[in-house]
Interface confidence: low
């Protein structure tokens, strides 16, 4: 009679993480008598996966009933596959012996490859805010995928970025992989509403890539521009001096009025108006009683924005020449600023 052969018909099996892997194995003869064992890997360090004779293998089930006398199908199923299960599995026939069974013949092996989905990409930006024209770094990380091949792209508002470097670790063979990418983004004044998107495409995602996002509103600081103007209001001897703070972000802003270098009033931006680009405008005003002054008054609007060094704009109020033209400033009524005379 022809000598028993152990046949593993599948050279490789590809399984998605979480699914069940079927590893096929058949023998060509019932002789010699003895059990089948499944191992992952070969040589002395091989790992026992299933032993027909004894042991507890909760994740492994047999395809056929191995207790039947004429059974020659020793295929197994391994449930809830993870990337850690990847490797080459060998179906090995043992011959009954005393005191121990003796290895008789091994199958050629079946390579189990596990496809595991990457985790949702996590995008993180710089720790500190930066101003327009500066280049900032964003990182994107995704983990736990297999096989190693993966594509990562960066977008800013739907436009693909090119300034990035991507690394997939580890470099050598592994049960699963991680990807880390750093992108450089140049900020513009219009970026308050902008988004940076990291997009990861992998064979397990079936053409539906995973995306991680970062809002540039958390990264950008748009410094304000200041304009100090005066207009006559109510009576000829009163002048409305306004400080218009334009196009700033974030909202955190403190304004101080100085009269000839002395602090007159400090207030925090509250009722701001929002521009289409996401930046804010705000206005503060003073009512100056010109008749109470003999000398010119130097009014300074000083703004501290988002903890940055103060910027200021000054205006020289000419006491000698009262402005004649009439004007109104309805925007000032919404600021919540206090009326104030200078004495």
């Amino acid at each position: 009679e022809e000598e028993l052969q152990v046949i593993q018909p599948d050279k490789s099996v590809l399984v998605a993480a979480g699914e069940t892997a079927t590893l096929r194995c058949t023998a060509t003869s019932l002789i010699p008598v003895g059990p089948i064992q499944w191992f992952r890997g070969a040589g002395p360090g091989r790992e026992l996966i299933y032993n027909q004779k004894e042991g507890h293998f909760p994740r492994v089930t047999t395809v056929s009933d191995l207790t039947k006398r004429n059974n020659m199908d020793f295929s197994i199923r391994i449930g809830n596959i993870t990337p850690a299960d990847a490797g080459t599995y060998y179906c090995v026939k043992f011959r009954k012996g005393s005191p121990d069974d003796v290895e008789f013949k091994s199958g050629a092996g079946t390579e189990l490859s596990v496809r595991a989905k990457p985790s949702a990409p996590v995008v993180s930006g710089p720790a500190a805010r930066a101003t327009p024209q500066h280049t900032v770094s964003f990182t994107c990380e995704s983990h736990g995928f297999s096989p190693r091949d993966i594509t990562l792209k960066w977008f800013k508002n739907g436009n693909e970025l090119s300034d990035f470097q991507t690394n997939v670790d580890p470099v050598g063979e592994s049960v699963s992989y991680s990807i880390h990418s750093t992108a450089k983004v140049v900020l513009t004044r219009e970026d308050v509403h902008s988004q940076v998107i990291c997009e990861v495409a992998h064979v397990t995602l079936q053409g539906d890539p995973l995306r991680g996002t970062a809002n540039l509103s958390e990264t950008i600081r748009v410094p304000p521009t200041l304009e100090v103007t005066q207009q006559p209001v109510r009576a000829e001897n009163q002048v409305n001096v306004t400080c218009q703070v334009r196009k700033f972000y974030p909202q955190r802003l403190q304004l101080t009025w100085l009269e000839n270098g002395n602090v007159s009033r400090t207030e925090t931006a509250s009722t701001v108006t929002e521009n289409k680009d996401g930046t804010y405008n705000w206005m503060s005003w003073l009512l100056v009683n010109v008749s109470a002054h003999r000398d010119d008054v130097k009014l300074t609007c000083q703004v501290e924005h988002d903890g940055q060094p103060a910027v200021s704009k000054s205006h020289d109020l000419k006491v000698s020449a009262h402005p004649k033209e009439q004007g109104s400033n309805t925007a000032a009524e919404n600021t919540g600023s206090n009326e104030r005379n200078i004495y």
């Epitope: 750093t182 450089k184 140049v186």
Partner: antibody
Framework: EVQLLESGGGVVQPGRSLRLSCAAS????????MGWVRQAPGKGLEWVAV????????YYADSVKGRFTISRDNSKNTLYLQMNSLRAEDTAVYYC???????????????WGQGTLVTVSS | DIQMTQSPSSVSASVGDRVTITCRAS??????LAWYQQKPGKAPKLLIY???SLQSGVPSRFSGSGSGTDFTLTISSLQPEDFATYYC?????????FGGGTKVEIK
Amino acid sequence: EVQLLESGGGVVQPGRSLRLSCAASGFTFSSYAMGWVRQAPGKGLEWVAVIWVDGSLKYYADSVKGRFTISRDNSKNTLYLQMNSLRAEDTAVYYCATGRETYSGPNWFDPWGQGTLVTVSS
Amino acid sequence: DIQMTQSPSSVSASVGDRVTITCRASQGISSWLAWYQQKPGKAPKLLIYAASSLQSGVPSRFSGSGSGTDFTLTISSLQPEDFATYYCQQAIYFPITFGGGTKVEIK
């Protein structure tokens, strides 16, 4: 006038080291990414390495990774390429080039230096 | 790595001819493509960037087109100074890669 002037090329034995320099003038060196591109005799262009404006990012071609190091000294307006463990296949004219976009990555290069020849031979 | 394939590898043409060089990327690169001209013994010179933008100082007879994977450099009326080798270059991924070059020779 914008100028890039490479120096440091020459004949070197396999396994030895060489450092190339590129002196920049006529533009704000510290505002541009810089790169090295090489061209083997009679062959096409091969990108070697690039460095960001502030030196925070450096990228290398696989063929030179671990052997070559790109660096810059913005105070001296100079770009460097330290080449270690040189091989015969590193023989080429080495060009230094400027990333075209201010504060951006080196998407396209302009201008280029005149090049310096590195010959690796025993 | 993204492979850049240029065709033809060489072309013979006469002064006044219209010359077209193509460049194909192994995967989509949007408009992140540049074209360079190189004359013997000289450094490359940027002609076109972002697939179709003409670099300052480059004659308008040079034009670029394409997006995604297929790109074209066209010289509308070849001049004596245009005989050179032309390279395309992708800039969307590292490593930055160049095409193999197209040599434009005098017929």
